[in-house]
């Protein structure tokens, strides 16, 4: 709204860089043939690029990326008791970012 | 995949808790009514709940909640050159979470 | 408030067959994931668990004890009870019944009886 | 089967002192299965501790804490108090065996 400023802090733009965010490990990552499961830890912190660049044209990338293999449990009611097997998900966490060119769409032929 | 654990480390969960998240300021937060102006910065960091809980009957929620006017530029084009306006947009930030019981959809009367 | 008491006698002859009654208030077997278990203990020795009835009528059992062990409910009267038949001196124990859930968290014995003790003598 | 091994079969502790319990699983099965931990005084039922390897149970004080995975499993008291000298059992189960108990461990005074 175009009103009173008196105690609005000038808004900083929230830069081009990684943050923490939250990646839901889904069922399909570890199983796809079964529903009966389910999978812990749920969800894991990996570091991703987020925030805005000074134009349109430009978008927040990620420069260099790794692979990071974390083990869960999948855990299965069997005779009503709860046994478990470990797994591995692999994570992608961004190092590093940058504002870059956005590609145009190539027309389709 | 249940493959080879060698590399990899036990998943720590997510925990439910506040983490920066970059917040999108929409034109129409600005202007309903006009779409032929940008706003700068277009986004700008808030502290939100994230995270996973213990189960699917639970999750993160605020439990607290602050409100922060922040002061934007609405720029117009009139007559080839920029006009800027200052405009207050109101922005929500989570001071503190908890995993909280849902509550089950009410039947549909 | 989850309670639960066991009964029975405090005596009983080599061979015969004893029958314990655990009794339960506080929540319902009938509930998804809810049973009943018995575990036993020897004077001065160690837990020894015996069987488990589910709300689904499920029965898993020592496979060491199988043949003498038999478990059933009654639902509508919140009661749990176990025979065991050909007992012997060495059956001699203090005879517990817990509630257990199947989680996916957990498989543990939450809430106890205080345990009837049992002998076994001619 | 799985067989659960206690260890030490006595500690003799004093209070205020940090007591560490172990509990060792043998193997075997391609699957893991959780460990609960309870406590037993004289004459009394034993009361859950621990679940699911690591969570207290509801109303027990954050001085007990249970840790490990696989086959190794430990259940700390940080602090003992005078009314933590006790029997302490693990529990754990399997798909054909069901439940197993540990043989205990005695935690008494010094």
């Known amino acids: 709204s175009l009103g009173s400023l008196t105690i609005a802090e000038p808004a900083m733009i929230a830069e081009c860089k990684t943050r923490t965010e939250v990646f839901e490990i889904s069922r399909r990552l570890i199983d796809r043939t079964n529903a009966n499961f389910l999978v812990w830890p749920p969800c894991v912190e990996v570091q991703r690029c987020s925030g805005c660049c000074n134009n349109r044209n430009v978008q927040c990338r990620p420069t260099q990326v790794q692979l990071r293999p974390v083990q869960v449990r999948k855990i299965e009611i069997v005779r009503k008791k709860p046994i478990f097997k470990k797994a591995t998900v692999t994570l992608e966490d961004h190092l590093a970012c940058k504002c870059e060119t956005v590609a145009a769409a190539r027309p389709v032929t | 995949s249940l493959g080879s654990l060698t590399i990899a480390e036990p998943a720590m969960i997510a925990e439910c808790k506040t983490r920066t998240e970059v917040f999108e300021i929409s034109r129409r937060l600005i202007d309903r009514t006009n779409a032929n102006f940008l706003v700068w910065p277009p986004c700008v960091e808030v502290q939100r709940c994230s995270g996973c809980c213990n189960n699917r009957n639970v999750q993160c929620r605020p439990t607290q909640v602050q409100l922060r006017p922040v002061q934007v530029r609405k720029i117009e084009i009139v007559r080839k050159k920029p006009i800027f306006k200052k405009a207050t947009v109101t922005l929500e930030d989570h001071l503190a979470c908890k995993c909280e019981t849902v509550a089950a959809a009410r039947p549909v009367t | 408030e989850v309670t639960l008491r066991e009964s029975g006698p405090a005596l009983v002859k080599p061979t015969q067959t004893l029958t314990l009654t655990c009794t339960f208030s506080?929540?319902?077997?009938?509930?998804?994931?809810?049973?009943v278990g018995w575990i036993r203990q020897p004077p001065g020795k160690a837990l020894e668990w015996l069987a488990n009835?589910?709300?689904?009528?499920?029965?898993y059992y020592n496979p060491s004890l199988k043949n003498r062990l038999t478990i059933s409910k009654d639902t509508s009267k919140n009661q749990v009870v176990l025979t065991m038949t050909n007992m012997d001196p060495v059956d001699t124990a203090t005879y517990y019944c817990a509630r257990i859930e199947s989680h996916w968290w957990s498989y543990a014995f939450d809430y106890w009886g205080q345990g009837t003790m049992v002998t076994v003598s001619s | 089967e799985i067989v659960l091994t206690q260890s030490p079969g006595t500690l003799s502790l004093s209070p205020g002192e940090r007591a560490t319990l172990s509990c060792e699983r043998s193997s075997g099965s391609n699957y893991d299965t959780y460990v609960s931990w309870y406590q037993q005084k004289p004459g009394q039922a034993p009361r859950l501790l621990i679940y699911a390897d690591d969570l207290r149970a509801s109303g027990i004080p954050d001085r007990f804490s249970g840790s490990g995975s696989g086959t190794d499993f430990t259940l700390t008291i940080s602090r003992l108090e005078p009314e933590d000298f006790a029997v302490y059992y693990c529990q754990s189960y399997g798909i054909e065996t069901d439940i197993v108990f540990g043989g205990g461990t005695k935690v008494e005074i010094k």
């Open positions: 506080g929540f319902s077997l009938s509930t998804y994931g809810m049973g």
């Open positions: 009835i589910w709300w689904d009528d499920d029965k």
